[in-house]
């Protein structure tokens, strides 16, 4: 191990230097260590499983964005191995506070049974 | 240029022993993780050997786990399967195939050497 | 092991049709599902790795789909050149394991 080395970088024995990780292509994340200094000899990348995607690099794949089940939101584009589900307008019986801050989430929509009286997607 | 080529088959009695190569050429055979697959006579493939590119990790499948070994020669370009306690059921081609590199699974095949077993 | 089935065995079609080869693991292998096509010299080539991937130099004419457990390879328009048997194999546990294969005749 060579603690000169960066957290994606490994010792190449034969030229002696640090030398960067092999990244992963989009849809897939590392498999076996490489870091450090070290780099495992069947360090590799694996496909993202389904219901996660990476942009690749050295991220792991993470699961994709639970627009109904989380948001309560249509959705809008379905994520693949590539890339997260993009979330649409609400479910039925739901509405989106406009004027509330994104939190870590972004939107989030809310059940019409709280919103203000008059609410343009509740009415009806 | 043929990139992977076997040699070694032949017949072979049960029992005896027999040690297969695969000559690797046009590309770099350290960088690579290397496998040894074989097809019994109207049979599907099977996966029997697996040797990293710098042999720190070895696997081999049940069927011939303890009887076979994979080894390789990283200087002389060259994949090795030495077969002892040969038996009828390892009547078949045998394929050398590379592990492409970080990924998990067979990219390139050699044309097969085939072993038969018998008295 | 992980069982890889390819219920058809051998299949029948024309030129120019689409054709659907299926596979299935006897649990998720999390795309780690591989395409392999070997001709009746004994040829053998990779065609789709994880899924949906095409292999380099190979025809957009294949394609794969599926995840879990259910996998499939579609040739969308049958060339003669297409009749070989094709395995599919699961990298996901070890031992790396492969369906029986299909084989693809011209009718």
């Known amino acids: 191990e060579d603690s000169n080395c960066g957290e994606n970088e490994y010792h190449n024995q034969t030229t002696g230097l640090c030398q960067q990780c092999p990244p992963c292509r989009p849809g897939e994340e590392p498999y076996m260590s490489c870091g450090y200094g070290t780099k495992d000899d069947d360090y590799g990348c694996v496909p993202c499983p389904a219901e996660k995607f990476s942009k690749g690099g050295y991220q792991i794949c993470r699961r994709h964005k639970d627009c109904e089940g989380f948001f309560r939101a249509t959705v809008l584009t379905p994520g693949d191995m590539e890339n997260d589900a993009e979330c649409g307008p609400c479910l039925p019986g739901y509405y989106m506070l406009e004027n509330r801050p994104r939190n870590i989430y972004g939107m989030v929509c809310y059940s019409c049974l709280l919103a203000p009286p008059n609410t343009k997607e509740c009415v009806g | 240029e043929v990139p992977l080529e076997e040699s070694g088959g032949g017949l072979v009695k049960p029992g005896g022993s027999r040690k297969l190569s695969c000559a690797a050429s046009?590309?770099?055979?350290?960088?690579?993780?290397m496998h040894w697959v074989r097809q019994a006579p109207e049979k599907g493939l099977e996966w029997i050997a697996y040797i990293s590119s710098g042999s720190s990790n070895v696997y081999y499948s049940d069927t011939v786990k303890g009887r076979f070994t994979i080894s390789r020669d990283n200087a002389k370009n060259t994949l090795f399967l030495q077969m002892t306690s040969l038996r009828s059921e390892d009547t078949a081609m045998y394929y050398c195939?590379?592990?492409?590199?970080?990924?998990?699974?067979?990219?390139?095949w050699g044309a097969g050497t085939t072993v038969t077993v018998s008295s | 092991d992980i069982q890889m089935t390819q219920t058809t065995s051998s299949l029948s079609a024309s030129l120019g049709d689409r054709v659907t080869i299926s596979c299935r693991a006897s649990q998720d292998i999390g795309n780690h599902l591989n395409w392999y096509q070997q001709k009746p010299d004994g040829t053998v080539k990779l065609l789709i790795y994880?899924?949906?991937r095409i292999h380099s130099g190979v025809p957009s004419r294949f394609s794969g789909s599926g995840s879990g457990t259910d996998y499939s390879l579609t040739i969308s328009n049958l060339e003669q050149e297409d009749i070989a048997t094709y395995f599919c194999?699961?990298?996901?546990?070890?031992?790396?394991?492969f369906g029986g294969g299909t084989k693809l005749e011209i009718k």
């Open positions: 046009g590309f770099t055979f350290s960088d690579h993780g």
């Open positions: 994880y899924t949906s």
């Open positions: 194999q699961q990298g996901n546990t070890l031992p790396w394991t």
């Open positions: 195939a590379r592990r492409e590199l970080l990924r998990f699974y067979f990219d390139v």
